[in-house]
Interface confidence: low
């Protein structure tokens, strides 16, 4: 009797890992959102990027939801979110509207529920491109660790749009749950 | 009987706590590379950094492999990945090549299965290190949640690998699993 | 007899995922720190920031503890830091000692066992913030993966204090534990 | 503007190397391509450089083709050369680092792969 | 690798000729046409799928985003005449060939 149920025992916790591993490991929320440079808005005011790509190259979701240019938190928990975006310019794209630029990335919570929307981050810097260059760069990375509750949404602004590079590995955003709220 | 039972489920339950602890938390593949200055390129051209130090001061690593300056993964996963890149030129180094510079990192990701290179994340800024100043000083930092399979290499290539800042405080990138592939 | 094991050992592995899932999930350290403004030094040295907010808008902490300008570790493992730090200067606020600036960052770890500071991240840049521009912005982020030991205490150095952006999207700085230490 | 150099006659399974200058630019802080057409047929990309470094290939070009370049030249060595690699070479020259749209392109040069 | 269509096309002074190119993945905006004629190198007249180059005529015209691209030159004068080629500008990894294979415009 006590072999026969030390077996079921062995067996019970070999499939309890197995699930224990998969609801633990394969549950947990990410995102990593890429820029949709086919809809970039014009212009060198500050804008929400609403056009991200969510499935292609290096760009995936999982547990979370895309919608609308934001991304939406479908399961409570602790956050760690972060944001690298490229600003370019060439002399074969035309002059710039003026040399002294400022250009910043926010990233910014709304909360459906009490309809406000809130700074979490903010990076960038003033920048001075002068024409006696024929090309410039600059790159901003912010990340923190926040608690996002379900139904609450993330979304990207930038100053300068016209200017941000296009490529995958230049400007996106992302997420991942590191942990449960208490 | 039933307490007996009682008694050994609670002894099997305890060790299988300790085993999946273990199991869970000590698997984790990480790795934090510190830059080797003692053999840093010369020159102003874009280049792979292959000397970094994997086991001394801050350096680590576990569950990855670092070989012929690429870092290797070992396990399947979604990964954090980041990179710290800081550039200095002081007056006293003698006069720079250029004062217009192009001072950029690209963490690229090579497979292989498929001998293909791809750029994950890249960062950096176009500067002008004018004579005026005694001492210039620039850092990059990129970060980003990537799908990584086993043998896949992740590097690092940089511009102007002449003016990296050789302290581990300083030049370094990382990896941190986060979550398996469903 | 056998029916009666079965159910309590569903009963019993049932409230032991409800334990691990609390010990894993809850128990993990992290803290995310804003800038307190009310408390910025002046001047253009490098100084330690001692002022932080750990309790209200997106500051917060969990099995870490604040005390005295740092950020002191209760739970050994390796956690990721980060910190993202926003300078900012506005013609209204008078002149600038100087146009040429070195703008810092140093996150440090100081044990208490063994008393030394060693820097663990450093980030910035030089800036020439010239008077034809009546407004200038730049923000630093570092991010890193480190073991850190019951007891040691993370703190922030920046030059420049008295340019700080005192938003709390701005100037903060945290960490979250990622993994135990084997 | 920029100016391919180095064309010529070469023998089946042979070396060639040719070379591209600028003016007007400096070829160091560019992007550089090299392309290809065989008479009568289409552009043919073959590889790209950074500024100081890193090339990188078309596919059908990796292990024959070579691009590297100096301060003042951006080169293209050829090997193991056979009449279909008769062809004119271009050399081009990026909108920016990391932008692969060609804005200057060169004359070309005859590269003719004969017995 | 980027199919462009068609081959070859004549078109009338004044009439309007369209060529499409086809990516075999998306590569956003991420495209560019060339104008080569015989003899010569080609010219860049569009980047990033729909904006003119410096000094290109506002008769070339280009659109599409995804894999679907089309260039139209509209008003077509006899210095129309010459091959177009396709670039895609999206990635140069694992390429073999990022032009299209060209198509003739032949002006009668």
């Known amino acids: 009797g006590s072999q026969h149920i030390r077996a079921e025992k062995a067996m019970v916790d070999g499939s309890w890992l197995d699930l224990a591993k998969r609801s633990k490991l394969e549950a947990q929320p990410f995102a990593h959102l890429t820029i949709n440079a086919t809809d970039i808005p014009s212009g060198s005011h500050k804008v929400s990027l609403s056009s991200w790509y969510h499935d292609r190259g290096w760009a995936k979701i999982s547990n979370m939801t895309f919608s609308n240019g934001k991304l939406i938190v479908n399961q409570d928990g602790f956050y760690y979110l972060y944001a690298n975006i490229c600003f370019r310019h060439h002399e074969t794209s035309g002059d710039l509207a003026t040399e002294y630029l400022q250009l910043m990335v926010y990233v910014t919570k709304t909360s459906i529920k009490i309809p406000s929307s809130h700074t979490l981050m903010k990076g960038g810097s003033t920048k001075y491109w002068s024409g006696n260059s024929e090309f410039h760069f600059y790159s901003i990375n912010v990340g923190g660790f926040f608690k996002l509750r379900s139904g609450e949404e993330i979304s990207i602004e930038v100053s300068n749009p016209s200017l941000l590079d296009p490529d995958q590995d230049a400007t996106y955003f992302g997420a991942f749950k590191v942990r449960d709220i208490d | 009987g039933s307490q007996h039972i009682r008694a050994e489920k609670a002894m099997v339950d305890g060790s299988w706590l300790d085993l999946a602890k273990r199991s869970k938390l000590e698997a984790q593949p990480f790795a934090h590379l510190t830059i080797n200055a003692t053999d840093i390129p010369s020159g102003s051209h874009k280049v792979s950094l292959s000397s970094w130090y994997h086991d001394r001061g801050w350096a680590k690593i576990s569950n990855m492999t670092f070989s012929n300056g690429k870092l290797i993964v070992n396990q399947d996963g979604f990964y954090y990945l980041y990179a710290n890149i800081c550039f200095r030129h002081h007056e006293t180094s003698g006069d720079l090549a250029t004062e217009y510079l192009q001072l950029m990192v690209y963490v690229t990701k090579t497979s292989i299965k498929i001998p293909s290179s791809h750029t994950l994340m890249k960062g950096g800024s176009t500067k002008y290190w004018s004579g005026n100043s005694e001492f210039h000083f620039y850092s990059i930092n990129v970060g980003g949640f990537f799908k990584l399979r086993s043998g896949e290499e992740i590097s690092i290539e940089v511009s102007n690998p002449s003016l990296l800042d050789p302290d581990q405080d300083a030049t370094y990138f990382g990896a941190f699993k986060v979550r398996d592939i469903d | 007899g056998s029916q009666h094991i079965r159910a309590e050992k569903a009963m019993v592995d049932g409230s032991w995922l409800d334990l691990a899932k609390r010990s894993k999930l809850e128990a993990q350290p992290f803290a995310h720190l804003t800038i307190n403004a009310t408390d910025i030094p002046s001047g253009s040295h490098k100084v330690s920031l001692s002022s932080w907010y750990h309790d209200r808008g997106w500051a917060k902490i969990s099995n870490m503890t604040f005390s005295n300008g740092k950020l002191i570790v209760n739970q050994d493992g390796f956690y990721y830091l980060y910190a993202n730090i926003c300078f900012r200067h506005h013609e209204t606020s008078g002149d600038l000692a100087t146009e040429y600036l070195q703008l810092m960052v140093y996150v440090t770890k100081t044990s208490i066992k063994i008393p030394s500071s060693h820097t663990l991240m450093k980030g910035g840049s030089t800036k020439y913030w010239s008077g034809n521009s009546e407004f200038h912005f730049y923000s630093i982020n570092v991010g890193g993966f480190f073991k850190l030991r019951s007891g040691e205490e993370i703190s922030i150095e920046v030059s420049n204090p008295s340019l700080l952006d005192p938003d709390q999207d701005a100037t903060y700085f945290g960490a979250f534990k990622v993994r135990d230490i084997d | 503007s920029v100016k391919e150099s180095g064309g010529g006659l070469v023998t089946p399974g042979g070396t060639l190397t040719l070379t591209c200058t600028a003016s007007?630019?400096?070829?160091?802080?560019?992007?550089m391509s090299w392309v290809r057409q065989a008479p009568g047929k289409g552009l043919e990309w073959i590889g790209y450089?950074?500024?100081?470094?890193s090339p990188y290939y078309a596919n059908w070009a990796k292990g024959r083709f070579t691009i590297s370049r100096t301060s003042t030249t951006v080169d293209l060595k050829m090997t193991s050369l056979t009449t279909e690699d008769t062809a004119t070479y271009f050399c081009?020259?990026?909108?920016?680092?990391?932008?692969?749209?060609?804005?200057?392109w060169g004359p070309g040069t005859l590269v003719t792969v004969s017995l | 690798d980027m199919i462009q269509t068609p081959a070859s096309v004549e078109v009338a002074v004044g009439g309007t000729v369209t060529i499409n190119c086809q990516a075999s993945?998306?590569?956003?905006?991420?495209l560019a046409w060339y104008q080569q004629k015989p003899g010569q190198p080609p010219k860049l007249l569009i980047y990033?799928?729909?904006t003119l180059a410096s000094g290109v005529p506002s008769r070339f015209k280009g659109s599409g985003s995804g894999t679907q691209f089309t260039f139209t030159i509209s008003d077509v004068e006899c210095t129309a005449a010459a091959t177009y080629y396709c670039?895609?500008?999206?990635?140069?990894?694992?390429?073999?060939?990022?032009f299209g294979g060209g198509t003739e415009v032949v002006v009668k």
């Open positions: 081009a020259r990026h909108v920016s680092d990391g932008g692969w749209y060609l804005y200057i």
């Open positions: 007007g630019f400096s070829l160091s802080n560019n992007a």
């Open positions: 450089i950074y500024p100081g470094g």
């Open positions: 993945q998306s590569i956003g905006s991420n």
């Open positions: 990033g799928a729909s």
């Open positions: 670039q895609q500008a999206y990635s140069i990894s694992n390429v073999d060939n990022a």
